[in-house]
Interface confidence: low
Amino acid sequence: ITRQSLDPQRRAAPQQKRSSPIEGLCPPGHHISEDSRECISCKYGQDYSTHWNDFLFCLRCTKCDSGEVEVNSCTTTRNTVCQCEEGTFREEDSPEICRKCRTGCPRGMVKVKDCTPWSDIECVHKES
């Protein structure tokens, strides 16, 4: 999953909704202005914030890589959810790429779990 680097100089477009911070924080879907006096809404489909925050910018929405499918699109309060395409899975140890699932089990083993976007097939030894 790639996140484009943010431009801290980005400024809100005039039409963006604004409100006042509460105790120095802005609600999900917003970021704080440079002088900390206003909350500025994130741009739908472009960036987001999930928690009360005092970011000077919203977080850039993730773009799904090739080999991934977009399960949920980005909103102002939630990042894009990307999932590995069928037949591939994401390992906990290397979450940045989707790996191909094994097509079968080694000799003497049987498949007990199918390939999912989160895990490879699972093989266990045949009972002798």
Epitope: S5, G24, S36, N53, L56
Partner: antibody, heavy 121, light 118 residues
Framework: EVQLVESGGGLVKPGGSLRLSCAAS????????MHWVRQAPGKGLEWVAG????????YYADSVKGRFTISRDNAKNSLYLQMNSLRAEDTAVYYC??????????????WGQGTLVTVSS | QPVLHQPPAMSSALGTTIRLTCTLR?????????VYWYQQRPGHPPRFLLR?????????GPQVPPRFSGSKDVARNRGYLSISELQPEDEAMYYC???????????FGSGTQLTVLS
Amino acid sequence: EVQLVESGGGLVKPGGSLRLSCAASGFTFSTYGMHWVRQAPGKGLEWVAGINYSGNNKYYADSVKGRFTISRDNAKNSLYLQMNSLRAEDTAVYYCARDHSTWLSRHLDYWGQGTLVTVSS
Amino acid sequence: QPVLHQPPAMSSALGTTIRLTCTLRNDHDIGVYSVYWYQQRPGHPPRFLLRYFSQSDKSQGPQVPPRFSGSKDVARNRGYLSISELQPEDEAMYYCAMGARSSVTHVFGSGTQLTVLS
């Protein structure tokens, strides 16, 4: 125990390059933002650059923008600062500091001992 | 004019209480900022002391004793670091930093050199 150990400092000629490293231990490096802060001899603290937990977002002081590059290798628990086109005014002790959060804030809770960079002909 | 102003030097006697000041330029409102304080003893790296936003939203650095405390004066646009029961090891440079907790870039004050008189 949190430990940050900088290395790579030394004497370099103006226009030259240097790469600083910071080896982190005692905490889950990949879940914290990191910074480089410098201090010229007899002067105050100057923030140089910051990088978020994943390395996807990097920020620089105007004085080093376009010349310095901050990066990290979470597999090696290491933070780096590639310094190019060095100037005499870059002479300073360079500190590696851990951010209190995954992102970047003004809350730098742990600092290394620093490494001295001298730019002189 | 710098964003943050700190007096270059202050002194106080051993065992007393001192209050260091960090003034935010008046085009910013300290009411919506956190104030951060760092200590740097001679020959040592800086050390995070504390963050202060309000009485209900503040944090102390690792192993920082409660003798060090923060406060703000919104009317004067100032942040303060109070050190009680001054000890010889408190002799150091003190830097403030201020702003939204997740501001992208950092600005430190120019620092105040504290001398502890015996």
